[in-house]
Protein backbone atom coordinates (compact mmCIF):
# COMPACT_ATOMS: atom_id res chain seq x y z
CA UNK A 1 0.00 0.00 0.00
CA UNK A 2 1.45 3.31 -1.19
CA UNK A 3 0.59 6.99 -1.55
CA UNK A 4 -1.16 7.75 -4.86
CA UNK A 5 0.84 8.38 -8.02
CA UNK A 6 1.07 11.83 -9.57
CA UNK A 7 -2.07 12.85 -11.48
CA UNK A 8 -1.90 14.85 -14.74
CA UNK A 9 -4.30 17.49 -16.06
CA UNK A 10 -4.21 16.53 -19.73
CA UNK A 11 -6.93 18.57 -21.40
CA UNK A 12 -9.04 21.71 -21.00
CA UNK A 13 -11.67 22.68 -23.54
CA UNK A 14 -14.31 25.36 -23.94
CA UNK A 15 -17.17 25.20 -26.44
CA UNK A 16 -17.57 28.97 -26.67
CA UNK A 17 -15.32 30.94 -24.26
CA UNK A 18 -18.21 31.13 -21.76
CA UNK A 19 -17.66 27.84 -19.91
CA UNK A 20 -14.84 25.30 -19.84
CA UNK A 21 -13.95 21.87 -18.54
CA UNK A 22 -10.62 20.30 -17.58
CA UNK A 23 -9.86 16.56 -17.30
CA UNK A 24 -7.11 14.74 -15.45
CA UNK A 25 -5.57 11.30 -15.52
CA UNK A 26 -5.18 9.68 -12.11
CA UNK A 27 -1.79 8.27 -11.24
CA UNK A 28 -1.53 4.83 -9.62
CA UNK A 29 -3.94 4.47 -6.72
CA UNK A 30 -1.44 2.82 -4.37
CA UNK A 31 -3.98 0.03 -3.80
CA UNK A 32 -6.20 2.28 -1.70
CA UNK A 33 -9.34 4.40 -2.26
CA UNK A 34 -8.14 7.76 -3.54
CA UNK A 35 -9.84 11.16 -3.49
CA UNK A 36 -9.10 13.82 -6.08
CA UNK A 37 -9.59 17.55 -5.77
CA UNK A 38 -8.78 20.29 -8.23
CA UNK A 39 -7.78 23.66 -6.87
CA UNK A 40 -7.09 26.84 -8.81
CA UNK A 41 -6.34 30.51 -8.54
CA UNK A 42 -6.41 33.26 -11.08
CA UNK A 43 -3.14 34.86 -12.12
CA UNK A 44 -2.41 37.86 -9.93
CA UNK A 45 -4.46 36.44 -7.03
CA UNK A 46 -3.35 34.31 -4.11
CA UNK A 47 -6.76 33.07 -3.00
CA UNK A 48 -7.17 29.37 -3.87
CA UNK A 49 -10.56 27.98 -4.95
CA UNK A 50 -11.79 24.43 -5.26
CA UNK A 51 -13.37 23.10 -8.43
CA UNK A 52 -16.98 24.33 -8.58
CA UNK A 53 -18.42 21.26 -10.38
CA UNK A 54 -16.99 17.75 -10.46
CA UNK A 55 -20.12 16.27 -12.09
CA UNK A 56 -20.92 17.92 -15.44
CA UNK A 57 -17.76 16.86 -17.29
CA UNK A 58 -17.86 13.23 -16.15
CA UNK A 59 -15.23 11.27 -14.18
CA UNK A 60 -11.96 12.99 -13.32
CA UNK A 61 -13.13 16.37 -14.51
CA UNK A 62 -13.82 19.88 -13.35
CA UNK A 63 -16.39 22.06 -15.06
CA UNK A 64 -16.32 25.85 -14.81
CA UNK A 65 -19.76 27.34 -15.43
CA UNK A 66 -20.41 30.86 -16.74
CA UNK A 67 -20.04 32.53 -13.37
CA UNK A 68 -16.59 30.95 -12.90
CA UNK A 69 -15.27 31.62 -16.42
CA UNK A 70 -13.41 34.75 -17.37
CA UNK A 71 -11.81 35.22 -20.78
CA UNK A 72 -9.37 37.83 -19.56
CA UNK A 73 -7.66 35.88 -16.75
CA UNK A 74 -5.24 32.98 -16.74
CA UNK A 75 -6.23 30.10 -14.45
CA UNK A 76 -3.48 28.26 -12.59
CA UNK A 77 -4.70 24.86 -11.46
CA UNK A 78 -3.50 21.60 -9.99
CA UNK A 79 -5.01 18.29 -8.91
CA UNK A 80 -4.37 16.76 -5.50
CA UNK A 81 -4.67 12.95 -5.11
CA UNK A 82 -5.02 11.72 -1.51
CA UNK A 83 -5.27 8.30 0.13
CA UNK A 84 -4.56 6.97 3.64
CA UNK A 85 -0.84 6.77 2.93
CA UNK A 86 -0.36 10.34 1.68
CA UNK A 87 -0.87 12.82 -1.16
CA UNK A 88 0.56 13.77 -4.49
CA UNK A 89 0.05 16.81 -6.69
CA UNK A 90 -0.07 17.27 -10.41
CA UNK A 91 2.11 19.87 -12.10
CA UNK A 92 0.50 23.29 -12.27
CA UNK A 93 -1.36 23.97 -15.50
CA UNK A 94 -1.85 27.48 -16.85
CA UNK A 95 -5.12 27.86 -18.74
CA UNK A 96 -6.19 30.79 -20.88
CA UNK A 97 -9.78 30.24 -22.03
CA UNK A 98 -9.12 32.08 -25.30
CA UNK A 99 -6.80 29.28 -26.44
CA UNK A 100 -8.80 26.20 -25.46
CA UNK A 101 -11.97 26.70 -27.46
CA UNK A 102 -13.18 23.62 -29.31
CA UNK A 103 -16.55 24.43 -30.86
CA UNK A 104 -19.36 22.07 -31.73
CA UNK A 105 -19.44 21.02 -35.39
CA UNK A 106 -21.04 23.36 -37.93
CA UNK A 107 -24.75 22.90 -38.58
CA UNK A 108 -27.14 22.65 -41.51
CA UNK A 109 -24.65 21.20 -43.97
CA UNK A 110 -26.31 21.32 -47.38
CA UNK A 111 -24.81 19.88 -50.55
CA UNK A 112 -26.25 20.42 -53.98
CA UNK A 113 -25.23 19.77 -57.58
CA UNK A 114 -25.59 22.97 -59.61
CA UNK A 115 -25.73 22.73 -63.37
CA UNK A 116 -25.86 26.23 -64.86
CA UNK A 117 -26.65 26.38 -68.57
CA UNK A 118 -23.74 28.63 -69.50
CA UNK A 119 -21.04 27.18 -67.23
CA UNK A 120 -19.59 23.92 -66.00
CA UNK A 121 -21.58 22.09 -63.29
CA UNK A 122 -20.28 22.12 -59.74
CA UNK A 123 -20.93 20.89 -56.22
CA UNK A 124 -22.25 23.62 -53.92
CA UNK A 125 -21.53 23.08 -50.21
CA UNK A 126 -23.08 25.36 -47.60
CA UNK A 127 -23.26 25.29 -43.78
CA UNK A 128 -23.93 27.41 -40.67
CA UNK A 129 -21.73 28.06 -37.63
CA UNK A 130 -22.52 26.14 -34.43
CA UNK A 131 -25.26 27.73 -32.34
CA UNK A 132 -23.21 28.18 -29.16
CA UNK A 133 -20.81 30.50 -30.94
CA UNK A 134 -21.74 34.17 -31.07
CA UNK A 135 -19.93 35.58 -34.09
CA UNK A 136 -21.58 38.99 -33.82
CA UNK A 137 -19.46 40.12 -30.86
CA UNK A 138 -16.29 39.92 -32.94
CA UNK A 139 -14.56 37.82 -30.26
CA UNK A 140 -14.68 34.86 -32.61
CA UNK A 141 -13.29 34.22 -36.03
CA UNK A 142 -14.34 30.75 -37.12
CA UNK A 143 -12.37 28.93 -39.78
CA UNK A 144 -13.74 25.96 -41.70
CA UNK A 145 -12.53 22.83 -43.44
CA UNK A 146 -14.48 20.61 -45.78
CA UNK A 147 -13.70 17.03 -46.56
CA UNK A 148 -15.22 14.88 -49.26
CA UNK A 149 -14.71 11.53 -50.92
CA UNK A 150 -16.49 9.07 -53.13
CA UNK A 151 -18.36 6.61 -50.89
CA UNK A 152 -15.98 3.72 -51.60
CA UNK A 153 -12.73 5.71 -51.63
CA UNK A 154 -10.21 5.22 -48.83
CA UNK A 155 -8.79 8.75 -48.63
CA UNK A 156 -10.58 12.00 -47.92
CA UNK A 157 -9.84 15.16 -49.87
CA UNK A 158 -9.58 18.10 -47.44
CA UNK A 159 -10.06 21.77 -48.28
CA UNK A 160 -9.42 24.75 -46.07
CA UNK A 161 -12.25 27.26 -46.62
CA UNK A 162 -11.15 30.16 -44.42
CA UNK A 163 -14.13 32.05 -42.99
CA UNK A 164 -16.44 31.18 -45.86
CA UNK A 165 -19.58 29.25 -45.01
CA UNK A 166 -19.85 27.94 -48.55
CA UNK A 167 -17.56 26.13 -50.94
CA UNK A 168 -17.60 25.14 -54.59
CA UNK A 169 -16.04 21.99 -56.09
CA UNK A 170 -15.96 21.71 -59.86
CA UNK A 171 -14.45 18.36 -60.83
CA UNK A 172 -16.13 15.20 -59.54
CA UNK A 173 -16.61 11.65 -60.77
CA UNK A 174 -19.97 11.28 -62.56
CA UNK A 175 -22.38 8.67 -61.23
CA UNK A 176 -20.63 8.35 -57.86
CA UNK A 177 -22.06 8.99 -54.42
CA UNK A 178 -19.93 11.42 -52.38
CA UNK A 179 -19.71 11.95 -48.62
CA UNK A 180 -19.22 15.53 -47.47
CA UNK A 181 -18.40 16.81 -43.98
CA UNK A 182 -17.40 20.15 -42.48
CA UNK A 183 -15.69 21.22 -39.25
CA UNK A 184 -14.66 24.50 -37.68
CA UNK A 185 -12.18 26.07 -35.31
CA UNK A 186 -11.63 29.50 -33.82
CA UNK A 187 -8.44 31.22 -34.95
CA UNK A 188 -6.61 30.29 -31.70
CA UNK A 189 -8.38 27.06 -30.76
CA UNK A 190 -9.02 23.46 -31.71
CA UNK A 191 -10.87 21.84 -34.60
CA UNK A 192 -14.38 20.70 -33.81
CA UNK A 193 -15.46 17.15 -34.59
CA UNK A 194 -16.56 16.64 -38.18
CA UNK A 195 -20.25 17.26 -38.81
CA UNK A 196 -22.43 14.25 -39.64
CA UNK A 197 -21.82 13.23 -43.24
CA UNK A 198 -24.11 14.42 -46.00
CA UNK A 199 -24.38 12.20 -49.06
CA UNK A 200 -24.79 13.49 -52.60
CA UNK A 201 -25.25 11.50 -55.79
CA UNK A 202 -23.35 13.01 -58.70
CA UNK A 203 -25.39 12.74 -61.91
CA UNK A 204 -23.91 10.53 -64.60
CA UNK A 205 -23.96 13.45 -67.07
CA UNK A 206 -21.83 15.63 -64.76
CA UNK A 207 -18.90 17.10 -66.74
CA UNK A 208 -15.75 15.80 -65.13
CA UNK A 209 -13.16 18.46 -66.00
CA UNK A 210 -13.57 22.20 -65.98
Amino acid sequence: QLPPGKPEIFKCRSPNKETFTCWWRPGTDGGLPTNYSLTYHREGETLMHECPDYITGGPNSCHFGKQYTSMWRTYIMMVNATNQMGSSFSDELYVDVTYIVQPDPPLELAVEVKQPEDRKPYLWIKWSPPTLIDLKTGWFTLLYEIRLKPEKAAEWEIHFAGQQTEFKILSLHPGQKYLVQVRCKPDHGYWSAWSPATFIQIPSDFTMND
Epitope: E157, H159, F160, F167, I169, L170
Partner: antibody, heavy 118, light 111 residues
Framework: EVQLLESGGGLVQPGGSLRLSCAAS????????WHWVRQAPGKGLEWVSD????????NYADSVKGRFTISRDNSKNTLYLQMNSLRAEDTAVYYC???????????WGQGTLVTVTS | QSVLTQPPSASGTPGQRVTISCTGS?????????VHWYQQLPGTAPKLLIY???WRQSGVPDRFSGSKSGTSASLAISGLRSEDEADYYC???????????FGGGTKLTVL
Protein backbone atom coordinates in the same frame (compact mmCIF):
# COMPACT_ATOMS: atom_id res chain seq x y z
CA GLU B 1 -10.41 35.67 -72.27
CA VAL B 2 -8.81 35.75 -68.79
CA GLN B 3 -6.19 38.49 -68.45
CA LEU B 4 -4.15 39.44 -65.39
CA LEU B 5 -1.78 42.38 -65.53
CA GLU B 6 0.55 43.21 -62.65
CA SER B 7 2.13 46.63 -62.19
CA GLY B 8 3.88 48.69 -59.54
CA GLY B 9 7.19 46.86 -59.39
CA GLY B 10 10.52 48.66 -59.51
CA LEU B 11 13.68 49.56 -57.66
CA VAL B 12 13.37 50.50 -53.98
CA GLN B 13 15.76 50.97 -51.07
CA PRO B 14 15.68 48.73 -47.98
CA GLY B 15 13.01 49.99 -45.59
CA GLY B 16 11.02 51.49 -48.46
CA SER B 17 7.51 50.74 -49.66
CA LEU B 18 5.81 49.70 -52.89
CA ARG B 19 2.24 48.95 -53.87
CA LEU B 20 1.65 46.26 -56.48
CA SER B 21 -1.56 46.06 -58.48
CA CYS B 22 -3.08 43.25 -60.49
CA ALA B 23 -5.79 44.29 -62.93
CA ALA B 24 -8.09 41.47 -64.01
CA SER B 25 -10.44 41.22 -66.96
CA UNK B 26 -12.46 38.65 -68.90
CA UNK B 27 -14.34 37.11 -65.93
CA UNK B 28 -16.15 37.97 -62.67
CA UNK B 29 -13.31 39.11 -60.40
CA UNK B 30 -15.38 38.99 -57.20
CA UNK B 31 -16.13 35.25 -57.52
CA UNK B 32 -12.56 34.15 -56.79
CA UNK B 33 -9.93 33.92 -54.11
CA TRP B 34 -6.73 35.78 -55.05
CA HIS B 35 -3.06 35.03 -54.35
CA TRP B 36 0.31 36.69 -54.55
CA VAL B 37 3.27 34.38 -55.21
CA ARG B 38 6.87 35.48 -55.64
CA GLN B 39 10.00 34.06 -57.23
CA ALA B 40 13.47 35.31 -56.29
CA PRO B 41 15.95 35.37 -59.18
CA GLY B 42 16.99 31.80 -60.05
CA LYS B 43 14.92 30.37 -57.18
CA GLY B 44 11.62 28.53 -56.70
CA LEU B 45 8.10 29.76 -56.09
CA GLU B 46 7.13 31.15 -52.67
CA TRP B 47 3.53 31.85 -51.70
CA VAL B 48 3.16 35.33 -50.17
CA SER B 49 -0.51 35.91 -49.37
CA ASP B 50 -4.10 35.17 -50.30
CA UNK B 51 -7.46 36.84 -49.83
CA UNK B 52 -10.93 35.36 -49.71
CA UNK B 53 -13.84 36.38 -51.90
CA UNK B 54 -15.37 38.46 -49.12
CA UNK B 55 -12.08 40.38 -48.48
CA UNK B 56 -12.34 39.97 -44.72
CA UNK B 57 -10.17 36.87 -44.58
CA UNK B 58 -6.49 37.04 -45.49
CA ASN B 59 -3.45 34.81 -44.98
CA TYR B 60 0.25 35.66 -45.10
CA ALA B 61 3.53 33.78 -45.23
CA ASP B 62 5.51 34.20 -42.00
CA SER B 63 8.28 35.96 -43.96
CA VAL B 64 6.00 38.92 -44.83
CA LYS B 65 3.55 38.98 -41.90
CA GLY B 66 3.20 42.46 -40.43
CA ARG B 67 4.94 44.09 -43.41
CA PHE B 68 2.73 43.24 -46.40
CA THR B 69 -1.02 43.79 -46.78
CA ILE B 70 -3.19 42.16 -49.42
CA SER B 71 -6.44 43.83 -50.46
CA ARG B 72 -8.91 43.82 -53.30
CA ASP B 73 -11.32 46.21 -54.92
CA ASN B 74 -14.10 44.21 -56.54
CA SER B 75 -15.55 47.32 -58.17
CA LYS B 76 -12.25 47.95 -59.97
CA ASN B 77 -11.47 44.26 -60.62
CA THR B 78 -8.09 44.84 -59.00
CA LEU B 79 -5.93 43.04 -56.44
CA TYR B 80 -3.27 44.91 -54.42
CA LEU B 81 -0.20 44.12 -52.36
CA GLN B 82 1.06 46.91 -50.13
CA MET B 83 4.69 46.15 -49.24
CA ASN B 84 6.32 48.08 -46.39
CA SER B 85 9.69 47.78 -44.62
CA LEU B 86 11.13 46.09 -47.68
CA ARG B 87 14.27 43.99 -47.34
CA ALA B 88 16.86 42.74 -49.83
CA GLU B 89 15.36 39.24 -49.52
CA ASP B 90 12.03 40.53 -50.87
CA THR B 91 13.67 40.98 -54.27
CA ALA B 92 11.66 38.80 -56.65
CA VAL B 93 9.20 38.65 -59.50
CA TYR B 94 5.72 38.96 -57.93
CA TYR B 95 2.85 37.12 -59.59
CA CYS B 96 -0.84 37.48 -58.92
CA UNK B 97 -2.90 34.32 -59.40
CA UNK B 98 -6.60 33.59 -59.42
CA UNK B 99 -7.84 31.00 -56.90
CA UNK B 100 -10.54 28.60 -58.01
CA UNK B 101 -12.03 25.71 -55.96
CA UNK B 102 -9.48 24.33 -53.53
CA UNK B 103 -7.89 27.75 -54.10
CA UNK B 104 -5.86 26.25 -56.93
CA UNK B 105 -4.08 28.98 -58.85
CA UNK B 106 -5.59 28.45 -62.28
CA UNK B 107 -4.47 31.67 -63.99
CA TRP B 108 -1.31 33.69 -63.36
CA GLY B 109 -0.20 37.15 -64.42
CA GLN B 110 3.09 37.69 -66.22
CA GLY B 111 4.75 39.03 -63.04
CA THR B 112 6.30 42.33 -61.95
CA LEU B 113 9.88 42.63 -60.73
CA VAL B 114 10.62 44.17 -57.34
CA THR B 115 14.27 44.94 -56.61
CA VAL B 116 15.28 46.00 -53.10
CA THR B 117 18.82 47.33 -53.00
CA SER B 118 20.79 50.21 -51.57
CA GLN C 1 9.68 23.18 -40.22
CA SER C 2 7.09 22.32 -42.86
CA VAL C 3 8.47 21.61 -46.32
CA LEU C 4 7.50 19.86 -49.53
CA THR C 5 10.54 18.05 -50.87
CA GLN C 6 11.08 17.50 -54.59
CA PRO C 7 14.13 16.17 -56.39
CA PRO C 8 16.02 19.17 -57.83
CA SER C 9 16.31 17.58 -61.25
CA ALA C 10 14.93 14.81 -63.44
CA SER C 11 15.62 13.80 -67.00
CA GLY C 12 14.46 11.46 -69.73
CA THR C 13 14.63 10.89 -73.43
CA PRO C 14 11.76 11.62 -75.82
CA GLY C 15 8.99 9.02 -75.49
CA GLN C 16 10.09 7.94 -72.02
CA ARG C 17 8.04 8.12 -68.81
CA VAL C 18 9.30 10.31 -65.98
CA THR C 19 7.97 10.62 -62.43
CA ILE C 20 8.55 13.56 -60.09
CA SER C 21 7.88 13.05 -56.39
CA CYS C 22 6.72 15.54 -53.75
CA THR C 23 7.12 14.49 -50.13
CA GLY C 24 5.35 16.37 -47.36
CA SER C 25 4.29 15.67 -43.79
CA UNK C 26 1.28 15.17 -41.56
CA UNK C 27 0.53 18.90 -41.56
CA UNK C 28 0.09 19.16 -45.33
CA UNK C 29 -0.15 16.22 -47.75
CA UNK C 30 -0.51 13.62 -45.01
CA UNK C 31 -3.19 15.74 -43.36
CA UNK C 32 -5.39 15.18 -46.39
CA UNK C 33 -4.96 18.52 -48.10
CA UNK C 34 -4.97 18.31 -51.87
CA VAL C 35 -1.86 18.71 -54.01
CA HIS C 36 -1.61 20.89 -57.11
CA TRP C 37 1.15 20.75 -59.74
CA TYR C 38 2.44 23.73 -61.72
CA GLN C 39 4.62 23.85 -64.81
CA GLN C 40 6.91 26.81 -65.46
CA LEU C 41 8.42 26.97 -68.92
CA PRO C 42 11.66 28.99 -69.19
CA GLY C 43 11.03 32.74 -68.92
CA THR C 44 7.27 32.44 -68.41
CA ALA C 45 4.75 32.53 -65.55
CA PRO C 46 3.74 29.24 -63.90
CA LYS C 47 0.78 27.35 -65.32
CA LEU C 48 -1.58 24.99 -63.47
CA LEU C 49 -1.08 21.44 -64.70
CA ILE C 50 -2.74 19.05 -62.23
CA TYR C 51 -5.13 20.06 -59.46
CA UNK C 52 -6.68 18.28 -56.48
CA UNK C 53 -4.17 15.42 -56.64
CA UNK C 54 -5.16 13.90 -59.97
CA TRP C 55 -7.35 16.19 -62.08
CA ARG C 56 -5.87 17.54 -65.30
CA GLN C 57 -6.38 21.23 -65.90
CA SER C 58 -8.31 22.06 -69.06
CA GLY C 59 -6.06 21.88 -72.14
CA VAL C 60 -3.38 19.74 -70.45
CA PRO C 61 -2.57 16.59 -72.47
CA ASP C 62 -3.40 13.22 -70.91
CA ARG C 63 0.32 12.36 -70.92
CA PHE C 64 0.35 14.21 -67.57
CA SER C 65 -1.11 12.50 -64.52
CA GLY C 66 -1.01 13.01 -60.78
CA SER C 67 -1.43 10.76 -57.76
CA LYS C 68 -1.24 10.99 -54.00
CA SER C 69 -0.67 8.48 -51.24
CA GLY C 70 -0.02 9.10 -47.57
CA THR C 71 2.40 12.00 -47.17
CA SER C 72 3.58 11.97 -50.79
CA ALA C 73 2.33 12.94 -54.22
CA SER C 74 3.76 12.39 -57.64
CA LEU C 75 3.52 13.76 -61.15
CA ALA C 76 4.01 11.34 -64.04
CA ILE C 77 4.75 12.41 -67.60
CA SER C 78 4.58 9.72 -70.23
CA GLY C 79 5.61 10.00 -73.88
CA LEU C 80 8.09 12.72 -72.95
CA ARG C 81 8.46 15.54 -75.47
CA SER C 82 11.00 18.32 -75.84
CA GLU C 83 8.36 20.96 -74.98
CA ASP C 84 7.97 19.34 -71.53
CA GLU C 85 11.37 20.74 -70.55
CA ALA C 86 10.45 23.04 -67.66
CA ASP C 87 10.43 23.48 -63.89
CA TYR C 88 7.66 21.58 -62.06
CA TYR C 89 6.33 22.58 -58.64
CA CYS C 90 3.97 20.84 -56.25
CA UNK C 91 1.88 22.89 -53.80
CA UNK C 92 -0.34 22.12 -50.81
CA UNK C 93 -1.94 24.00 -47.93
CA UNK C 94 -0.20 23.50 -44.57
CA UNK C 95 -2.20 23.41 -41.33
CA UNK C 96 0.63 24.38 -39.00
CA UNK C 97 1.79 27.30 -41.16
CA UNK C 98 -1.75 28.29 -42.09
CA UNK C 99 -0.38 28.98 -45.54
CA UNK C 100 0.49 27.49 -48.91
CA UNK C 101 3.69 25.55 -49.39
CA PHE C 102 5.44 25.08 -52.70
CA GLY C 103 7.96 22.34 -53.28
CA GLY C 104 11.48 23.46 -54.17
CA GLY C 105 10.85 22.66 -57.83
CA THR C 106 12.19 19.99 -60.17
CA LYS C 107 14.01 20.94 -63.35
CA LEU C 108 13.06 18.45 -66.06
CA THR C 109 15.53 18.00 -68.90
CA VAL C 110 14.61 16.16 -72.08
CA LEU C 111 17.82 14.62 -73.36
Amino acid sequence: EVQLLESGGGLVQPGGSLRLSCAASGFTFSSYWWHWVRQAPGKGLEWVSDIARASSYTNYADSVKGRFTISRDNSKNTLYLQMNSLRAEDTAVYYCARGLDARRMDYWGQGTLVTVTS
Amino acid sequence: QSVLTQPPSASGTPGQRVTISCTGSSSNIGYGYVVHWYQQLPGTAPKLLIYRNNWRQSGVPDRFSGSKSGTSASLAISGLRSEDEADYYCAAWDDSLNGWLFGGGTKLTVL
